[in-house]
């Protein structure tokens, strides 16, 4: 099975690597522009140079290309707690990340928010916090895990999942209540 190619990929595949087909003359292969530059004018003929210009401030191209415009630099989303790890250069987009002791929660493919790593109070660290995953906690006896925090079994209601984990405590509470009424 041949993978489906778009028109641009079809045109490029006729030329050797690092070159592309002249849009007005399919017998000419022009050299692609280096990263950090963009296509200003196609090469006038075979063996002649493509006119490539450097990206202006605030834009970039990260790979060889024949784009008519550079791509706009991404901005880190402060409202999502993101910080700039490295600023945009002509050949590399801005790199955004989170502060120390934070992890990324991806809302969608290109959108993440920074959250503080759980400290596992009233529990122990089962798996350390990672770039894209919160700490995994194991709770001490008398506590259960709710939204990755160890909560006292005294906050466990019968309808919740915690009843299995807190069963001995619940039974003890019932026992003391019963003995108090006799």
């Amino acid at each position: 099975l041949v993978p489906h190619l778009g028109d641009r990929e079809k045109r490029d595949s006729v030329c050797p690597q690092g070159k592309y087909i002249h849009p007005q003359n399919n017998s000419i292969c022009c050299t692609k522009c280096h990263k950090g530059t963009y296509l200003y004018n196609d090469c006038p003929g075979p063996g002649q140079d493509t006119d490539c210009r450097e990206c202006e401030s605030g834009s970039f191209t990260a790979s060889e290309n024949h784009l008519r415009h550079c791509l706009s630099c991404s901005k880190c989303r402060k409202e999502m707690g993101q910080v700039e790890i490295s600023s945009c250069t002509v050949d590399r987009d801005t790199v955004c990340g989170c502060r120390k002791n934070q992890y990324r929660h991806y809302w969608s493919e290109n959108l993440f928010q920074c959250f503080n790593c759980s400290l596992c109070l009233n529990g122990t660290v089962h798996l350390s916090c990672q770039e894209k995953q919160n700490t995994v906690c194991t709770c001490h006896a008398g506590f259960f895990l709710r939204e990755n925090e160890c909560v006292s079994c005294s906050n466990c209601k019968k309808s919740l999942e915690c009843t299995k984990l807190c069963l001995p405590q619940i039974e003890n509470v019932k026992g003391t209540e019963d003995s108090g009424t006799t």
Epitope: H105, W107, S108, E109, N110, L111, E147
Partner: nanobody, 120 residues
Framework: EVQLLESGGGLVQPGGSLRLSCAAS????????MGWVRQAPGKGLEWVSF????????YYADSVKGRFTISRDNSKNTLYLQMNSLRAEDTAVYYC?????????????WGQGTLVTVSS
């Protein structure tokens, strides 16, 4: 077919409260993060709040932090937005939206919207 149906909008006085609901159908609700987006008259779209499927992660715009609370009931396929201490600047059409897992757009489906008017 994905459907998102908002309700609960209306006219409220400054300082008042409203609770918006969004009934979702046509997809597995428990698999997707959901959100509320609003558009004030003559303004662009503003992200208001997001919530992930287990209700562990939430996002609030600075303009609504401490006043609005997002929640969801996965057993009822319903998303909520509790809005307290409403201000005139909260006047907008509020849209319930399904967050896209892939691609460059944050949302892939929207409801028709419900109008919230804050006025004395």
């Amino acid at each position: 077919e994905v459907q998102l149906l908002e309700s609960g909008g209306g006219l409220v006085q400054p300082g008042g409260s409203l609770r918006l609901s969004c009934a979702a159908s046509g997809f597995t609700f428990t698999r997707y993060s959901m959100g509320w987006v609003r558009q004030a008259p003559g303004k662009g779209l503003e992200w208001v709040s997001f919530i992930d499927p287990p209700s562990v992660h939430t996002y609030y715009a600075d303009s609504v932090k401490g006043r609005f609370t997002i929640s969801r009931d996965n057993s009822k396929n319903t998303l909520y937005l509790q809005m307290n201490s409403l201000r005139a600047e909260d006047t907008a059409v509020y849209y319930c939206a399904k967050i896209s897992q892939f691609g460059s757009n944050a949302f892939d489906y929207w409801g028709q919207g419900t109008l919230v008017t804050v006025s004395s």
